[in-house]
């Protein structure tokens, strides 16, 4: 195992669940900072949308449309004009993503936000199966700040099956996080948006390496789950969190113990969402299967606030408030494992919208 | 096939400089851009040491052991990282390897330093 750098200087947990889980139920209402930014169209389109930070820099004119590279920001991911070429991208700039890659201008991006009564209830939709996940302390795996989020590259050998047939492998774990006064998730549930979102990402066992797999449809798999407050620590979570001030700068990526990786998702992986969209970062690219978890996690308020003031990204800028604005639906379906809309009626609904990763 | 490519090791005195190169090939070449970069060195009976990370928007953090001496650099459009190795010392002597940090590790077959008189 390689030696890590820090700084370049150098078990289950909450009782009967990993999570602490809390249902996201047909009761979740959006506050009105995080209601939607337009109401749809009449045409039942879906709008395009844009962080409320893009919504004030167009307003104030502040974006330089010259260069991919986004005026600075207190939360901000910038890059410091280092070398030449760069691909620069922030998410104080999701607005030039485009012009870092085409695919961010698809018409099935993420993330998305999840209409609960839109949902359409499909019986096919098995429980997702994990295997390997529970990690022994060694051998240890690197946790690194790459400038945009906090990453834990995942070892072989974690196997997830979507289905009959459709088995990936995980390839890294990573969060999405906002500040100690703004919610931070990336995918958004009838509007609302949660403190934080873990994503697992997992490669297809069709395909050898991710650059294969990009853009080709089920090539990439992600798990998704919400973190929500809680008054108790999740002890999972504190495995990667006690960590975070080793690796506050840019660049820093140190080894930790391995850990058990089913404990940071929901206990519950029967109740999910399920659709077809996109890396939610730059190149963007499309085809991926997202399965986003009913059940949330739950964290402490201290270890929610450890999150998102432990990091540091480009240009001595907090790390902070790193997720997308939900990208409009363009006619996708989102699939619900369970009844999930608010008239649901007995019968399922859509039954025949069900698609496999691939198809 | 190669994915990553190192290039410019050799021997070289106590107190000299080497630049070692990475080029991107094939399918590594389209996310490139989006890596973050680094260089590792492995010496004999030693476990494998990250030595430099150069993240996609160009921030740098280097191991205490070369803080100083070595520098980082990329440039996208030719898909390469350099490694600049200056006031280099014996205990430098190891197999470098390129690394492309992009979801999954991405590795080259690493090239040869050795600093001795």
């Known amino acids: 195992q390689p030696q890590g750098l820090s700084g370049m200087q150098g078990e289950p947990s909450l009782g009967d669940s990993s999570s602490g889980e809390d249902e996201l139920g047909v009761d979740v209402l959006p506050s009105e900072e995080d209601a939607p930014e337009e109401a749809d169209p009449p045409d039942g389109e879906d709008p395009p949308e844009v962080n409320s930070e893009d919504r004030m820099e167009e307003s104030l004119g502040l974006e330089d449309l010259s260069t991919p590279e986004a005026p600075e920001h207190s939360q901000g991911s910038h890059g410091d004009e280092k070398g030449g070429g760069h691909s620069h991208w922030s998410y104080g700039g999701t607005l030039l993503w485009p012009q870092v890659s085409p695919a961010c201008a698809g018409r099935f991006q993420s993330p998305v936000d999840i209409r609960l009564e839109r949902t359409a209830f499909c019986r096919t939709l098995q429980p997702l199966e994990l295997l390997g996940y529970e990690l022994q302390p060694l051998p240890e795996l690197s946790l690194s700040n790459n400038g945009h989020t906090v990453q834990l590259t995942l070892p072989p050998g974690l196997k997830m099956a979507l289905g009959p047939g459709q088995e990936y492998r995980a390839l890294q774990l990573h969060l999405h996080w906002g500040t100690s006064d703004h919610p931070g998730s990336e995918h958004t549930v009838n509007g609302h948006r949660f403190p934080a979102e873990i994503h697992v990402v997992h490669l297809s066992t069709a395909f050898s390496e991710l650059h294969e797999a990009l853009g080709r449809p089920g090539g990439l798999a992600v798990l998704a789950a919400f973190l929500q407050e809680s008054p108790e620590e999740n002890s999972a979570y504190e495995q990667l969190l006690s960590h975070l001030e080793e690796i506050s700068e840019e660049g820093s990526k140190i080894e930790i113990p391995g850990l058990d990786v089913s404990a940071l998702l929901p206990s519950d992986l029967s109740r999910y969402y399920r659709y077809e969209g996109s890396l939610t970062t730059p190149p963007c690219s499309q085809g991926v299967i997202w399965t986003v978890f009913n059940e949330t996690v739950k964290l402490s308020a201290k270890q929610l606030h450890t999150l998102s003031v432990s990091l540091w990204g480009p240009r001595d800028s907090r790390l902070q408030l790193n997720f997308r604005a939900t990208q409009p639906l363009n006619g996708r379906t989102i699939e619900a494992s369970f009844p999930a809309a608010e008239d649901s009626s007995p019968e399922p609904v859509h039954v025949n919208s069900c698609f496999t990763a691939g198809d | 096939q190669v994915q990553l490519q190192e290039s410019g090791g050799g021997l070289v005195q106590p107190g000299g400089s080497l630049r070692l190169s990475c080029a991107a090939s094939?399918?590594?070449?389209?996310?490139?851009?989006?890596?973050?970069m680094a260089w590792y060195r492995q010496a004999p009976g030693k476990q494998r040491e990250l030595v430099a990370v150069i993240t996609s928007a160009g921030g740098t953090q280097y191991s205490s052991s070369v803080k100083g001496r070595f520098t980082i650099s990329r440039d996208n459009a030719k898909k390469t990282v350099l490694l600049q190795m200056n006031s280099l010392k014996p205990e430098d002597t190891a197999v470098y390897y390129c690394?492309?940090?992009?979801?999954?590790?991405?590795w080259g077959q690493g090239t040869q330093v050795t600093v001795s008189s």
């Open positions: 094939g399918g590594a070449r389209n996310i490139f851009s989006f890596a973050a």
């Open positions: 690394n492309a940090d992009y979801y999954q590790d991405y």
